[in-house]
């Protein structure tokens, strides 16, 4: 008979996760040879300690820490970029400007990156019908546990001017329940990050007002003012030129606004 | 289970240009680097490059620079070498290989391709 | 480049012999990061695609029978088979696994009197 299984809200666990966490470990460290020392078997070991085993409705930061401390990487100062509900163009331009890193361009994030994951309590297997929905289950999931840890970090560690890509299209354009509103803005630190910059990307074409001057950007504007560190805003009109000027910045279209 | 399939035999004029296929089952591509290798008859193994079939990003040994091209078709989940301008140097067997924690675990069949006029 | 030298070439022996196939390579393939040498041996079997047997110069790869045995760190490589069996007819073959371009060594080419 097939063992009883807790029933959750939330999608299962990734089809063939350990394999692509391996995979995509190997691969990571092929292509950054600044972490050829890493031990992707280990890194595998400490990933799966995390959930495995355990209810996954009590996950804590602490159980990741063997991982973050195997995944521990730098990103130069002035070259952190944060974003929120805009992963895609994020991604499409640190692909670009290769010398800039969001989250999931770091050993970690990379690892984690649009899987799921969750075992179950006293039994060594992963859940692969479903997982804990943050919403309709519980916050304190694999998932969203392992996010909410490796921001912090993430954040922790950023210096220079940080940058932060946010979607301008919303209706909350910076959300105080977003990871970046509630984990990585309040764990910037004003002794090593002197300045946040946000650029607001529009969705619309004709979409020519000041983003800048949005309700919620005053808001984070004002958070992190009260944390002693300077903030600047950008709207980013043209994302499509934007990301084309990033590309060949000698064109001559890109001496104009974006 | 792991498998790397490659595609048919090929013999081809010296000048002419082939692309070899190499079609992954058992794992999505695009979270593993594609590896291409050279085995020359009664001969020992060169390492071509890699291609990340993610974003194309390509690596290649300075011999192979100019030599080879490779692709990647994530869709198909199939990496391609290229290979133009051909000479009797380059008939070989084409391994395509994928590396799991260290080392090239993974293999496929190989490729002959003969280059005689 | 790393070149990888292998010697000897070529070797004869009976089954059930021990045998030992030296690898040298031009530069140091130990990661001062963790303190491993990134080496690996294959075994090529004619007709058939390279095996991998053992990676970080010593790790047996899953199915390799235990009488495959890597051992040696820098840049001085041996694998030894401790009583040779007449399925070990094959090529071996090292490999720089540690920096670009990837370099394999010319193979030593075993085979049973």
């Known amino acids: 008979l097939p063992r009883w299984r807790q029933q959750w809200s939330g999608s299962g666990t990734t089809s063939r996760f350990p394999e692509t966490v391996l995979a995509r470990c190997v691969k990571y460290t092929e292509v950054h040879p600044e972490m050829r020392h890493v031990d992707c078997q280990s890194v595998w070991d400490a990933f799966k300690g995390a959930f495995i085993s355990k209810y996954p409705c009590n996950i804590t930061e602490e159980d990741y820490q063997p991982l973050v401390k195997l995944g521990t990487q730098t990103v130069p100062c002035n070259k952190t970029l944060l974003w929120s509900r805009i992963k895609d163009l994020a991604h499409q331009f640190t692909q670009v400007q290769r010398d800039m890193f969001t989250l999931e361009d770091m050993l970690l994030g990379y690892l984690a990156d649009d899987l799921t994951w969750c075992g179950e309590f006293n039994t060594f297997e992963i859940n692969y019908q479903s997982c804990p929905d943050w919403r309709k289950d519980c916050s304190n999931n694999p998932v969203s546990v392992f996010w909410k840890t490796v921001s912090r970090r993430f954040a922790e560690t950023a210096c220079g001017v940080v940058h932060v890509m946010l979607n301008g299209s919303r209706s909350k354009i910076f959300d105080k329940n977003s990871t970046f509103g509630s984990v990585e803005v309040h764990n910037l630190q004003p002794e090593k990050v002197q300045a946040l910059e946000a650029w607001v990307i529009h969705g619309g074409r004709e979409d020519s007002r000041d983003l800048c001057q949005d309700p919620t950007i005053k808001e984070l504007e004002s958070i992190i003012s009260k944390r002693n560190i300077r903030f600047f805003c950008k709207n980013i009109y043209r994302p499509d030129k934007f990301l084309q000027c990033v590309k060949n910045p000698e064109d001559s279209s890109c001496l104009s606004g974006i | 289970e792991v498998q790397l399939q490659q595609s048919g035999a090929e013999f081809v004029r010296p000048g002419a240009s082939v692309k070899l296929s190499c079609t992954a089952s058992?794992?999505?591509?695009?979270?593993?680097?594609m590896h291409w290798v050279k085995q020359r008859p009664e001969q020992g193994l060169e390492w071509i490059g890699w291609?990340?079939?993610?974003?194309?990003?390509?690596k290649y040994a300075p011999k192979f620079q100019d030599e080879a091209t490779l692709t990647a078709d994530t869709s198909s989940n199939t990496a391609y070498l290229h290979l133009s301008s051909l000479t009797s140097e380059d008939t070989a067997i084409y391994y395509c290989?994928?590396?799991?924690?260290?080392?090239?675990?993974?293999w496929g069949q190989g490729t002959l391709v003969t280059v005689s006029a | 480049d790393i070149v990888m030298t292998q010697s000897p070439s070529s070797l004869s022996v009976s089954a059930g012999e021990k045998v030992t196939m030296s690898c040298k390579s031009s530069q140091s393939l130990l990661n001062s990061g963790n303190q491993k040498n990134y080496l690996a041996w294959y075994q090529q079997k004619p007709g058939q695609p390279p095996k991998l047997l053992i990676y970080g110069a010593s790790t047996r790869e899953s199915g390799v029978p235990d009488r495959f045995t890597g051992s040696g760190s820098g840049t001085d490589f041996t694998l030894t088979i401790s009583s040779v069996q007449a399925e070990d007819l094959a090529v071996y073959y090292c490999q720089n696994d540690h920096s670009y371009p990837y370099t394999f060594g010319g193979g030593t080419k075993l085979e049973i009197k």
């Open positions: 058992g794992f999505n591509i695009k979270d593993s680097l």
């Open positions: 291609i990340d079939p993610e974003d194309d990003k390509t």
């Open positions: 290989a994928r590396r799991f924690l260290r080392g090239f675990a993974y």
